[in-house]
C-alpha cells in the first residue's frame, strides 16, 4: 500500500480550523491478523529523509494522536486529551485519514507528517508516511479561508477548503 497526500500545502488565516488529510492507497489486507497504526506528528524541512524526525503537535506526541484498527475501519482519537488541545485525528472506511486543528495560530505553521504502519502478527511490516506544509498567515495578505494546493503537478489550480 501507499500513502497519498491530496494536498501538499495548506494556507490558512489565523483563528481558522483546518483538516490535514492523507489517504491509504492500494490493496489493504483485511485479515484478522492485520491492523494499521496511524498517527500524525510535526517534522522539519532540510533533512536527509522527510518525516524522520517526530516532533509533537501542540505538545501532543505521535503516541497521543495515534489510531489503531483493522483494515478500512473507522476510528477517532481519544477525545479528551486531543480536544483540550484543539486537535482530533480520524480515519474513515475509505482509507482517508485526517487531523483537524482548531483555532490556528502562527505557531502551528510547519511541516506535518502522517504515518501508517501495517502490523501483522505483532510485527511492523510496512511503514509509509506523507508530508504536507501548513502556513498560517495573519494581516491583510492572509486569505479569508484556508486555501489548499494539490500535490499533483498536473492540478495547478488552487482548491479552497470548505
Amino acid at each position: 500500500f501507499k500513502v497519498a497526500t491530496p494536498y501538499s500545502l495548506y494556507v490558512c488565516p489565523e483563528g481558522q480550523n483546518v483538516t490535514l488529510t492523507c489517504r491509504l492507497l492500494g490493496p489493504v489486507d483485511k485479515g484478522h491478523d492485520v491492523t494499521f497504526y496511524k498517527t500524525w506528528y510535526r517534522s522539519s524541512r532540510g533533512e536527509v529523509q522527510t518525516c524522520s524526525e517526530r516532533r509533537p503537535i501542540r505538545n501532543l506526541t505521535f503516541q497521543d494522536l495515534h489510531l489503531h484498527h483493522g483494515g478500512h475501519q473507522a476510528a477517532n482519537t481519544s477525545h479528551d486529551l486531543a480536544q483540550r488541545h484543539g486537535l482530533e485525528s480520524a480515519s474513515d472506511h475509505h482509507g482517508n485519514f485526517s487531523i483537524t486543528m482548531r483555532n490556528l495560530t502562527l505557531l502551528d505553521s510547519g511541516l506535518y507528517c502522517c504515518l501508517v504502519v501495517e502490523i501483522r502478527h505483532h510485527h511492523s511490516e510496512h511503514r509509509v508516511h506523507g508530508a504536507m506544509e501548513l502556513q498560517v498567515q495573519t494581516g491583510k495578505d492572509a486569505p479569508s479561508n484556508c486555501v489548499v494546493y494539490p500535490s499533483s503537478s498536473q492540478d495547478s489550480e488552487n482548491i479552497t477548503a470548505a
Partner: antibody, heavy 120, light 111 residues
Framework: QVQLVQSGAEVKKPGASVKVSCKAS????????MHWVRQAPGQGLEWMGA????????SYNQKFKGRVTMTRDTSTSTVYMELSSLRSEDTAVYYC?????????????WGRGTLVTVSS | DIVMTQTPLSLSVTPGQPASISCRAS??????????VHWYLQKPGQPPQLLIY???NLESGVPDRFSGSGSGTDFTLKISRVEAEDVGVYYC?????????FGQGTKLEIK
Amino acid sequence: QVQLVQSGAEVKKPGASVKVSCKASGYTFTDYWMHWVRQAPGQGLEWMGAIETSLNYPSYNQKFKGRVTMTRDTSTSTVYMELSSLRSEDTAVYYCARWGIYGNPWFAYWGRGTLVTVSS
Amino acid sequence: DIVMTQTPLSLSVTPGQPASISCRASESVDSYVNSFVHWYLQKPGQPPQLLIYRASNLESGVPDRFSGSGSGTDFTLKISRVEAEDVGVYYCQQSNEDPYTFGQGTKLEIK
C-alpha cells in the same frame, strides 16, 4: 547474534509493583516488537503482551490490561515490563522474547528469565 | 481466546523408541496456506527453545528426529527415536490470533 539479557530476581510484597528489564543486542532494536511471556512455578507459559519498539506502542493481553505497562528506551535498546498490584499468583519467571527473522510469528529468541516472587 | 489442549500431559519413553504428542486448538489456527502452530522444548532451568515452526518446519540446529504435522485444529509433534537429551516439557503455541496461547505442556521422561 541476538541476545536478550534480563534483570535479576526480585522479591516483592503483595500490592507492590515490579519492573523487569530486557536489554537487546545483536540486531536493530527498533525493527522488532518485544514480547513478554510468564511462567508460574510448575505451570505453563502465558503471553502478557508486546511493545512496538520504534513507536513505543504496547499491545497487552486483555487479562493484564490495567496492571501491566510496557515501555522501551531506544538509547539503551532496553524494554521494560512493569506489573502493579502484585498478588501471590504473580509469582513467576518472566521472559522477554522476540519473533524470528523478518517478524515471523514464533518465539525464536528468549531471555533467560527473571524470577519475581510475591510474598508477604 | 484460542485454547490449546495437549495430550498426553506426561510421557515415559525408552531411549530409541518413538514418541508422539498431540495438540488440539479450540478453533482453526490456519491463515491462508499457513498453520500458525509452533512447538517448543523447555529443559529444566532454561527458557523454551523453538523446535518446529508453522506446524511442520524444523528450526535450524534442531535434530531431524523431530517432526511436526497437522493443520486446522489438530497438530502432532513426533520424535522418531527418543534420546536422553530430549527430556523436558514440550509446548505447542498458536500465533494466529492475539492473545497468543500455549498448550499446558507435556513432560517427557526417559524410562
